[in-house]
């Protein structure tokens, strides 16, 4: 599909990302496909990631992601998480798309991916408080490592948005 056609299709619902950074993918003979992420987003595997520098509540962070046709980060693999960690600042905490709306420790990902306790990356002492119903990625100095921490959803934090790559 030509980018001009894509633009045409998108203008009806407003083009959010006016500049894309694309990589050519190897396709069958006489077909060229481009795999793109919006400018200033990070690319990894089949997704694009935006790391905010502004702080907001969990709900507002999710809304900000939605405005960019994305959602708060859903962590599916260790490799994906390690990639994200490499791009974060150790002194900040970042909301991800995991929350416990009822405070019953029934964790839910924003995209409905099933929560799997055996594939979690909680810091050793976490989650620490059922009144803390949203999850951030943060860096702990002892032991030195990134991990998950439950926090108050209203407390402003930075965030990570995720969207699937755009294919042209």
């Amino acid at each position: 599909q030509k980018y001009s056609q894509l633009l045409e299709k998108k203008t009806t619902k407003e083009l959010v990302h006016t500049t894309l950074e694309c990589v050519k993918k190897n396709m069958p003979v006489e077909e060229t496909a481009w795999s793109c992420c919006p400018k200033n987003w990070k690319s990894f595997s089949s997704n694009c990631y935006f790391i905010s520098t502004e702080s907001a509540s969990w709900q507002d962070s999710e809304k900000d992601c939605a405005r960019m046709e994305a959602h708060l980060l859903v962590i599916n693999t260790q490799e994906e998480q390690d990639f994200i960690f490499q791009n974060l600042q150790e002194e900040s905490a970042y909301f991800v798309g995991l929350s416990d709306p009822e405070g019953q420790r029934h964790w839910q990902w924003v995209d409905q991916t099933p929560y799997n306790e055996s594939s979690t990356f909680w810091h050793p002492r976490e989650p620490s408080d059922p009144n803390e119903r949203c999850v951030v990625l943060n860096f702990r100095k002892s032991p030195k490592r990134w991990g998950w921490n439950d926090v108050n959803c209203l407390g402003p934090q930075r965030s990570v948005c995720e969207m699937m790559k755009i294919h042209l």
Epitope: R105, E117, R125, S128, P130
Partner: antibody
Framework: QVQLQQSGTELMKPGASVKISCKAT????????IEWVKQRPGHGLEWIGE????????NDNEKFKGKATITADTSSKKAYMQLSSLTSEDSAVYYC??????????WGQGTLVSVSA | ETTVTQSPASLSMAIGEKVTIRCVTS??????VNWYQQKPGEPPKLLIS???TLRAGVPSRFSSSGYGTDFVFTIENMLSEDVADYYC?????????FGGGTKLEIK
């Protein structure tokens, strides 16, 4: 209100095992970490380990690895600690406590375990 | 493991005096220190939780301060009912570790 009721005194022989319990009431058992703490006269307080009942996740003090096993049953709202291969060094009062944030906010009354031949 | 050194081990104070107990940790634990009071035959009672936060229902004569590795617990005007053992607990790192305790008596 939050209450932790522990099982009664245990008089044990060296080499035996004992399983003590901690029954939680007044809150959602599965959502808070339960701690186990040992107290011997002249030895102060020692943290043994903790469990988050809803997930079964545990954190253990290396010092008690092989000695203490912590489990929980959400249906009965009970946490358990089994102590194996008992010696006189294991004679102590054992407390369970519920964590809130990073504080041991609510405590059981304690279970005395006495080991002697 | 974070070791916690609590001092003094025992303290004899007159009613109305100011009591100060100190805990020093071997690693930086921000302000994740708790302070407990224990009377004979009873479990420890949480007085002050992490962040130097006085627990609900605890008299305001109890307070604490400190950050990093150095922490101080204070009783502003000692009463006879304050006679007890006092412990600090560092909850910043696993394994959690307690100070050795301070036995507070009346002079």
């Amino acid at each position: 209100q939050v209450q932790l009721q522990q099982s009664g005194t245990e008089l044990m022989k060296p080499g035996a095992s004992v399983k003590i319990s901690c029954k939680a009431t007044g809150y959602t058992f599965s959502t808070y970490w339960i701690e186990w703490v040992k107290q011997r006269p002249g030895h102060g307080l020692e943290w043994i380990g903790e469990i988050l009942p809803g997930s079964g996740r545990t954190n253990d003090n290396e010092k008690f690895k092989g000695k203490a096993t912590i489990t929980a049953d959400t249906s009965s709202k009970k946490a358990y600690m089994q102590l194996s291969s008992l010696t006189s060094e294991d004679s102590a009062v054992y407390y369970c406590a519920r964590r809130g944030g990073y504080s041991f906010a609510f405590w059981g009354q304690g279970t005395l375990v006495s080991v002697s031949a | 493991e974070t070791t916690v050194t609590q001092s003094p081990a025992s303290l004899s104070m007159a009613i109305g005096e100011k009591v100060t107990i100190r805990c020093v940790t071997s690693t930086d634990i921000d302000d994740d220190v708790n302070w407990y009071q224990q009377k004979p035959g009873e479990p420890p009672k949480l007085l002050i939780s992490e962040g130097n936060t006085l627990r609900a229902g605890v008299p305001s004569r109890f307070s604490s301060s400190g950050y990093g590795t150095d922490f101080v617990f204070t009783i502003e005007n000692m009463l006879s009912e304050d006679v007890a053992d006092y412990y600090c607990l560092q909850s910043g790192n696993l394994p959690y570790t307690f100070g050795g305790g301070t036995k507070l008596e009346i002079k």
